[in-house]
Every structure is written in structure tokens, then in C-alpha cells.
């Protein structure tokens, strides 16, 4: 499985989409999981509502947010407020009982925000209403490069 | 006139079977989720289970004091949603009510329930 | 399971008057509540969902507020008709109801 490389400005909101097969994994839900270790396990992070039928409500652990768009087949992941401690490799997954199929690895880079050795000023990060959006999860802020690359054996 | 209608009600021993229908009229059934609750006489409500609209192909959801006994199940052509009940007890005499949950511009649907039937009465007793 | 506590179960108030009724979660169900009126012997009605949007057709004395785990239901000045008992429902988890909170009239 290819790993893609996400690069997010550290203190914004970068967004990962994982795209799978609708009809294949109806009625899973999703997870997106840290991975501890090259060899290690996958840390659950945020999985998606208990029902799957809610599954296109955002559900929220710390500053992840999850929501799953299961009729177009596409799970989207914000990390809000990235810091460098969120740097690392990470998987979404989708949930068959006590299994895990990895549907996408994600290396996440976090850039130093260049503004944070200068004076800010009055630069305005819009923050995300807690209202119900349902699949809408809001568009990232950050400057994100999408790149795709074979895993080293 | 936007409108539900469950039916089928009535007095069932324990053990034995009984099927709910909930008619829609005045809305295109197939784009919404349908939902079964039920209130016990005195009580508060309880959510039985709900069926997702026709994108959905019909996935259902159920808590967990029905799951395996009871089943939702949907008729387009005939804007009916029914809830089979198998292996009926003593604790599922209630009220059933139908409702239909809001849907949302861009196809989701919402679980706020904006639309309910008047309600059947279903009696367990031996 | 999230458990949902309504409070008071019971109030008694004269018309006009501002009612206020509380819905506490067990856990942070964010704004993933709606409230319902149920008149006796009637069905449940929706008056207010995601915590504080107001549904169609529904008198503005009716308003709701809160997140994560506290929640409250307002009725700025109390009508004869609103006479009912409110229940509180939350998604996060499943479909789970708060046990009702009866509205009479002084």
C-alpha cells in the first residue's frame, strides 16, 4: 500500500480524505489509528459514530475530528491545530469486527509556521462551529502537498 | 398533508409475533429514514430502531433490548415501514409510534425525528 | 451507554412565567441533542435540534443552549397551551432520552 505524504503549517487545521470502495465496506466503520513504530501497532485516534447510519456526523477526540461520507466512500480526518508532537504515520481504517483493513497510510509532516518567530498581528484563523455539518467538514487552511510514493522494503 | 399512520396493533401473548405497519403519505417516503419508538404506559421514550432511506438500501440499526427479535423493514412502492416483532415479552407492551427523521439538503438525513404517527398500542400478556 | 438526566421531573408554574428545564449527559455529546414536547395522549413533537436550532413552525418562547454535557431548555413565558412533558434526546451515541420533565400550570 502506497504511504502519502500530507504537509500541514504548524497551529492550522490540515484535512486528510481517504477514498475506498462504497459498496465494499457498507456498514464498516472507520478509524483513523497512529502508527507506533515502523512495525509497531496502530494507536486508535478517532473512529467514526457507533452507528453507521450517523456515520457522516463528526465525531471528535482531542483536536481529530472524523467523518465518514459512506455513500460517496470517503472518510475525511481534520487535525486541528497541528502541532509538531502530531508529526508521524498514521492509517485510516475500516472496521469489520475485530479486524482492520487499512484502507490508507498518511505520513504526516508539520512545517514551522515562519509567522511564529515574527509578530503575528492580526492574522485570523477562523475557527470550526460545533454545529451539526454532516459531511461538510470544513476546508483546510493549510498549504497541504500530496504525494505518493512506493514503501521502502 | 404531510402524515403517518402505524397500524397493527393489539393484544399478543408472550412468545408469539406481531407486525406494525406505518403508512406515509403527503412526502416522498423513499429519501427519508424511518424510525420505531415506543413508551411504555407511564414511561418515558425509548428508540427501537431505525431504517435508512432508499440510498441506504435499506441498512437498519436497532437497540440493544430488540436486536434479533425485532426487524424494520420498508415498501417503497407502497410508502409503508414496518417493524416485525418476534418473540414478543411482557416489557415490550407500549405505545409504537413511527416518525420520520429530517433530512438535509446535500442527501444526509438528520436523527431528529419531525413527523410522527398518533401511535398503536401493542399489549403482551398471557 | 450515555445516560441522560433531566431535571426537574416536574414543575409547576404560572402563565407567563420563564420555565427552565436541564439535560445533564454522562459523557460530551458536543451539540448532538434535540428536544421534543409531548402533549398527553399525544404523539411527540420536535421543537428544537443540534441543542439550539429552532424547528420550523415552532413559537420563538421556545429556545434551547448548551454543549458537551449541559444542556437547557428554555420557555421564556409560559402558555396554557404548552402545558406537556419535554424530553431531551441525544445522537452521540445512539438515541437515547432524558425520563421527561412534566409542565403543569399553577
Known amino acids: 500500500l502506497n504511504t502519502t505524504v500530507l504537509q500541514g503549517m504548524a497551529g492550522q487545521s490540515l484535512r486528510v480524505s481517504c477514498t475506498y470502495d462504497a459498496l465494499k465496506h457498507w456498514g464498516r466503520r472507520k478509524a483513523w489509528c497512529r502508527q507506533l513504530g515502523e512495525e509497531g501497532p496502530c494507536q486508535r485516534v478517532v473512529s467514526t459514530h457507533g452507528v453507521w447510519l450517523l456515520a457522516f456526523l463528526k465525531k471528535r477526540n482531542g483536536s481529530t475530528v472524523i467523518a465518514d461520507d459512506t455513500l460517496a466512500g470517503t472518510v475525511t480526518i481534520t487535525l486541528k491545530n497541528l502541532q509538531a508532537g502530531d508529526a508521524g504515520l498514521y492509517q485510516c481504517q475500516s472496521l469489520r469486527g475485530r479486524e482492520a483493513e487499512v484502507l490508507q497510510k498518511v505520513l504526516v509532516e508539520v512545517l514551522e509556521d515562519p509567522l511564529d518567530d515574527q509578530d503575528a498581528g492580526d492574522l485570523w484563523v477562523p475557527e470550526e462551529s460545533s454545529s451539526f455539518e454532516g459531511a461538510q467538514v470544513e476546508h483546510s487552511t493549510s498549504r497541504n502537498q500530496e504525494t505518493s510514493f512506493p514503501p521502502t522494503s | 398533508e404531510v402524515q403517518l399512520v402505524e397500524s397493527g396493533g393489539g393484544l399478543v401473548q408472550p412468545g408469539r409475533s406481531l407486525r406494525l405497519s406505518c403508512t406515509a403519505s403527503g412526502f416522498t417516503f423513499g429519501d427519508y429514514a424511518m424510525s420505531w419508538f415506543r413508551q411504555a404506559p407511564g414511561k418515558g421514550l425509548e428508540w427501537v430502531g431505525f431504517?435508512?432511506?432508499?440510498?441506504?438500501?435499506?441498512?437498519?440499526e436497532y437497540t440493544a433490548s430488540v436486536k434479533g427479535r425485532f426487524t424494520i423493514s420498508r415498501d417503497g412502492s407502497k410508502s409503508i415501514a414496518y417493524l416485525q416483532m418476534n418473540s414478543l415479552k411482557t416489557e415490550d407492551t407500549a405505545v409504537y409510534y413511527c416518525?420520520?427523521?429530517?433530512?438535509?439538503?446535500?442527501?444526509?438525513?438528520?436523527?431528529?425525528?419531525?413527523?410522527w404517527g398518533q401511535g398503536t398500542m401493542v399489549t403482551v400478556s398471557s | 451507554d450515555i445516560q441522560m438526566t433531566q431535571s426537574p421531573s416536574s414543575l409547576s408554574a404560572s402563565v407567563g412565567d420563564r420555565v427552565t428545564i436541564t439535560c445533564q449527559a454522562s459523557q460530551d455529546i458536543t451539540n448532538y441533542l434535540n428536544w421534543y414536547q409531548q402533549k398527553p395522549g399525544k404523539a411527540p413533537k420536535l421543537l428544537i435540534y443540534d441543542a439550539s436550532n429552532l424547528e420550523t413552525g415552532v413559537p420563538s418562547r421556545f429556545s434551547g443552549s448548551g454543549s458537551g454535557t449541559d444542556f437547557t431548555f428554555t420557555i421564556s413565558s409560559l402558555q396554557p397551551e404548552d402545558i406537556a412533558t419535554y424530553y431531551c434526546?441525544?445522537?452521540?451515541?445512539?438515541?437515547?432520552f432524558g425520563g421527561g420533565t412534566k409542565v403543569e400550570i399553577k
Open positions: 434526546q441525544e445522537y452521540d451515541q445512539y438515541l437515547t
Open positions: 431504517i435508512g432511506s432508499k440510498a441506504y438500501g435499506g441498512t437498519t
Open positions: 416518525a420520520r427523521g429530517k433530512r438535509r439538503d446535500y442527501g444526509y438525513w438528520h436523527p431528529a425525528f419531525d413527523v
